[in-house]
Interface confidence: medium
């Protein structure tokens, strides 16, 4: 009679996380007498997965009734698979011995790979705001996926971006992987309502990619434009000068009026007008008593926006 | 048969405080017979972490069932890790002996480092107030973090500050560290509504820094400006003189009127007008009966603000 062979027909098996994995094994003979065990890995550090005769293995069930006479099928099913279960599984035949049973023959091994979904991508933007025409960086991260093959794309308002760099870690074999990508985005004045999107495609997602988003409103500062004009007034001894502060973002704005370089009034913008592109406008006016001045007056509208250095615009008021 | 080896596969393991640490250890043989123990540190002062056979180690669980026949995996998991658990852990095999078991072989050791979050930064300002144009110091403290690498930044109203000095203690190795930083801030008249922010970034914070704040309103004193003017009155024998006290902070203010150097009336400011910059204005008036005076009267408005030395402004009232 030919010597017993241990047949593991599949070289590899791929299972989605949470599902059960069936690992097949068959013997070609009933002799010699002795138990079958399943191990993950080989050598001294191998991990016992199932022992036919003793032990407690609640996640493992046998496909056949191992105790049936003439049974040669020693396939097992492992429930609730996680990425940590990945590895090579060996079906091993032992021969009864004293004091211990002796390993007789091992199967060739079946590599179990676990398909695990990537986590929802998290997109984060720059720590400080930047102004239009400048470039800012956004990062996208996702973890816990397997296998390693994955595709990441960046979009700005639906338009695909090309200036980005992506890493998948670790470089070697692992039970699961992480992806990290950094995209460089050039800001424009109209970007207050813009969005960047990080899109991840993976075999586990059945063609339905995961997306993470970030709003450019958190990353942009649009500095205001100033215009100072004199408005007509009925009263002869009064002049009304307005300062139109236009197209700024975010809201925070403090305006100071100076008469010949001396502070006349300071106010904080509150009731703003929002433009369609998400920027704001605001207007302030100053009533000047012309009787109080002999000579011409230089009126300056000075604006501090979002904690930045102040900008100003001046207007020469002629005293006739 | 080869002599037993004790395998500790990881040279180092890093764990976040509060999590569990898995320390892996495997034997290459079942012989000699004797228990396995885990220690922290080496030499005479080493600390017993786990004894396979006896003792009470509620934080330690074994990864495998140590009593299973042929078990060679003596990995352990230590729950609820704190910075005090940092150190090098050794898996040690003993050989049964009399009267005591004898140490047979030790693993190479696994260094456990603990990542611990810094405490919420506490920002404290100067003990006494200072006036605009002066420099005040703010301190920021945070404790209990590990590893030692940490970044601290100061901001005033969103603008990064550069004049500060930071120390991380202790200088040598420790289970956890503290940071102490002192920033020097130049006060301006508009700083009543200003804030200083101490921002701490650490590997444990996943890019979401901790912030501590202090209001400059606690540190600043803006001294008042005084203006004394005479208001027109219908009654011929009465003069109304007002003292306009402007742009002061904090509230505490006592005003005294003097007529030719003699105290006429003292009052404490109560109903104040708050300016947009957070400073206060207040006005006091004095009705002077001109009939009671033969000669011109010098009226003095004397103001004691926030416990400081009094300032005054005088006005000569002409008695026609």
């Amino acid at each position: 009679e030919d010597e017993l062979q241990v047949i593991q027909p599949e070289k590899s098996v791929s299972v989605a996380a949470g599902e059960s994995a069936t690992l097949r094994c068959a013997m070609t003979s009933l002799i010699p007498v002795g138990p079958i065990m399943w191990f993950r890995g080989a050598g001294a550090g191998r991990e016992l997965i199932y022992n036919q005769k003793e032990g407690h293995f609640p996640r493992v069930t046998t496909v056949s009734e191992l105790t049936k006479r003439n049974n040669l099928d020693f396939s097992i099913s492992i429930s609730n698979i996680t990425p940590a279960d990945a590895g090579t599984y060996y079906c091993v035949k032992f021969r009864k011995g004293s004091p211990d049973d002796v390993e007789f023959k091992s199967g060739a091994g079946t590599e179990l790979s676990v398909r695990a979904k990537p986590s929802a991508p998290v997109v984060s933007g720059p720590a400080v705001r930047a102004t239009p025409e400048h470039t800012v960086s956004f990062t996208c991260e996702s973890h816990g996926f397997s296998p390693r093959d994955i595709t990441l794309k960046w979009f700005k308002n639906g338009n695909e971006l090309s200036d980005f760099q992506t890493n998948v870690d670790p470089a070697g074999d692992s039970v699961s992987y992480s992806i990290h990508s950094t995209a460089r985005v050039v800001l424009t004045r109209g970007d207050v309502h813009s969005q960047v999107i990080c899109e991840i495609a993976h075999i586990t997602l059945q063609g339905d990619p995961l997306r993470g988003t970030a709003n450019l409103s958190e990353a942009i500062r649009v500095p205001p434009t100033l215009e100072v004009t004199q408005q007509p007034m009925r009263a002869e001894n009064q002049a009304n000068v307005t300062c139109q502060v236009s197209n700024f973002y975010p809201r925070g704005l403090q305006l100071t009026w100076l008469e010949n370089g001396n502070v006349s009034r300071t106010e904080t913008a509150s009731t703003l007008i929002e433009n369609k592109d998400g920027t704001y406008n605001w207007m302030s006016w100053l009533l000047v008593n012309t009787c109080a001045h002999r000579d011409d007056v230089v009126l300056t509208c000075q604006v501090e926006h979002d904690g930045q250095q102040a900008v100003s615009k001046s207007y020469a008021l002629e005293i006739s | 048969e080869d002599e037993l080896q004790v395998i500790q596969p990881e040279k180092s393991v890093s764990v976040a405080a509060g999590e569990s640490a898995t320390l892996r250890c495997a034997m290459t043989s079942l012989i000699p017979v004797g228990p396995i123990m885990w220690f922290r540190g080496a030499g005479a002062g080493r600390e017993l972490i786990y004894n396979q056979k006896e003792g009470h180690f509620p934080r330690v669980t074994t990864v495998s069932e140590l009593t299973k026949r042929n078990n060679l995996d003596f990995s352990i998991s230590i729950s609820n890790i704190t910075p005090a658990d940092a150190g090098t852990y050794y898996c040690v095999k003993f050989r049964k002996g009399s009267p005591d078991d004898v140490e047979f072989k030790s693993g190479a050791g696994t260094e456990l480092s603990v990542r611990a979050k810094p405490s919420a930064p506490v920002v404290s300002g100067p003990a006494v107030r200072a006036t605009p144009e002066h420099t005040v110091s703010f301190t920021c403290e945070s404790h209990g973090f590990s590893p030692r690498d940490i970044t601290l930044k100061w901001f005033k109203n969103g603008n990064e500050l550069s004049d500060f000095q930071t120390n991380v203690d202790p200088a040598g190795d420790s289970v956890s560290y503290s940071i102490h930083s002192t920033a020097r801030v130049v006060l301006t008249r508009g700083d009543v509504h200003s804030q200083v922010i101490c921002e701490i970034a650490h590997i444990t914070l996943q890019g979401d820094p901790l912030r501590g704040t202090a209001n400059l309103s606690e540190a600043i004193r803006v001294p008042p400006t005084l203006e004394v003017t005479q208001q027109p009155m219908r009654a011929e024998n009465q003069a109304n003189v007002t003292c306009q006290v402007s742009n002061f902070y904090p509230r505490g203010l006592q005003l005294t009127w003097l007529e030719n150097g003699n105290v006429s009336r003292t009052e404490t400011a109560s109903t104040l007008i708050e300016n947009k910059d957070g400073t206060y204005n207040w006005m006091s008036w004095l009705l002077v009966n001109t009939c009671a005076h033969r000669d011109d009267v010098v009226l003095t408005c004397q103001v004691e603000h926030d416990g400081q030395q009094a300032v005054s402004k005088s006005y000569a009232l002409e008695i026609s």
Partner: antibody
Framework: EVQLVQSGAEVKKPGATVKISCKVS????????MHWVQQAPGKGLEWIGR????????KYAPKFQGRVTITADTSTNTAYMELSSLRSEDTAVYYC??????WGQGTLVTVSS | EIVLTQSPATLSLSPGERATLSCSAS???????LYWYQQKPGQAPKLWIY???NLASGIPARFSGSGSGTDFTLTISSLEPEDFAVYYC?????????FGQGTKLEIK
């Protein structure tokens, strides 16, 4: 739940032998050392010895060496302590304990002629 | 063998007071191997403190343990009526294992 249940009180004559049992539940006796401790009336605790039920290896305190035998039956999850050549000063409560953490309720042995 | 000497033999205190119980070893004991037990009349000893300073499950926080080398201490910050009992220190650093002779904590 871990439980150690000891056999009942014994009265013995000087020179006799007593064998006390300690049946455990909630764990496998092979997993831990089993200790025995003596407490004479109004006195403190005294360690007698221990067994490793996995391979029946024992350790004894010099004071009890030669008179005490500790055994274990892994099939019934029970440990035993046998003390021979009893004398009046052996009158005491005897405790079994699992790995120093869990104790039996104690067995009173009275040696009296 | 390592001899453990406990002091005082008897400690008479009132509820609310602080109690300090000492255990001195004739040679050095690693802190991992020093345990304390509480025993009340007619009951088996209960593990109270393990590895010098760790409270066993369910033991109130008013108890604490400290020490190293040859000198170990059990402290009760503010005595409660149920704390009055006998306390034993125990070493299992080397054979033969030994107990201290006990400290009886009684109500004054």
């Amino acid at each position: 739940e871990v439980q150690l249940v000891q056999s009942g009180a014994e009265v013995k004559k000087p020179g006799a032998t007593v064998k006390i049992s300690c049946k455990v539940s909630g764990f496998n006796i092979k997993d831990y050392y089993m200790h025995w401790v003596q407490q004479a009336p109004g006195k403190g605790l005294e360690w007698i010895g221990r067994i490793d039920p996995e391979d029946a290896e024992t350790k004894y305190a010099p004071k009890f060496q030669g008179r005490v035998t500790i055994t274990a039956d892994t099939s019934t999850n029970t440990a035993y302590m046998e003390l021979s050549s009893l004398r009046s000063e052996d009158t005491a409560v005897y405790y079994c304990d699992r790995g120093l953490a869990y104790w039996g309720q104690g067995t009173l042995v009275t040696v009296s002629s | 063998e390592i001899v453990l000497t406990q002091s005082p033999a008897t400690l008479s205190l009132s509820p609310g007071e602080r109690a300090t119980l000492s255990c001195s070893a004739s040679s050095s004991v690693s802190s991992s191997y020093l345990y304390w037990y509480q025993q009340k009349p007619g009951q088996a000893p209960k593990l109270w403190i393990y590895s010098t300073s760790n409270l066993a499950s369910g033991i109130p926080a008013r108890f604490s343990g400290s020490g190293s080398g040859t000198d170990f201490t059990l402290t009760i910050s503010s005595l409660e009526p149920e704390d009055f009992a006998v306390y034993y220190c125990h070493q299992w650093s080397s054979y033969p294992y030994t107990f201290g002779q006990g400290t009886k904590l009684e109500i004054k």
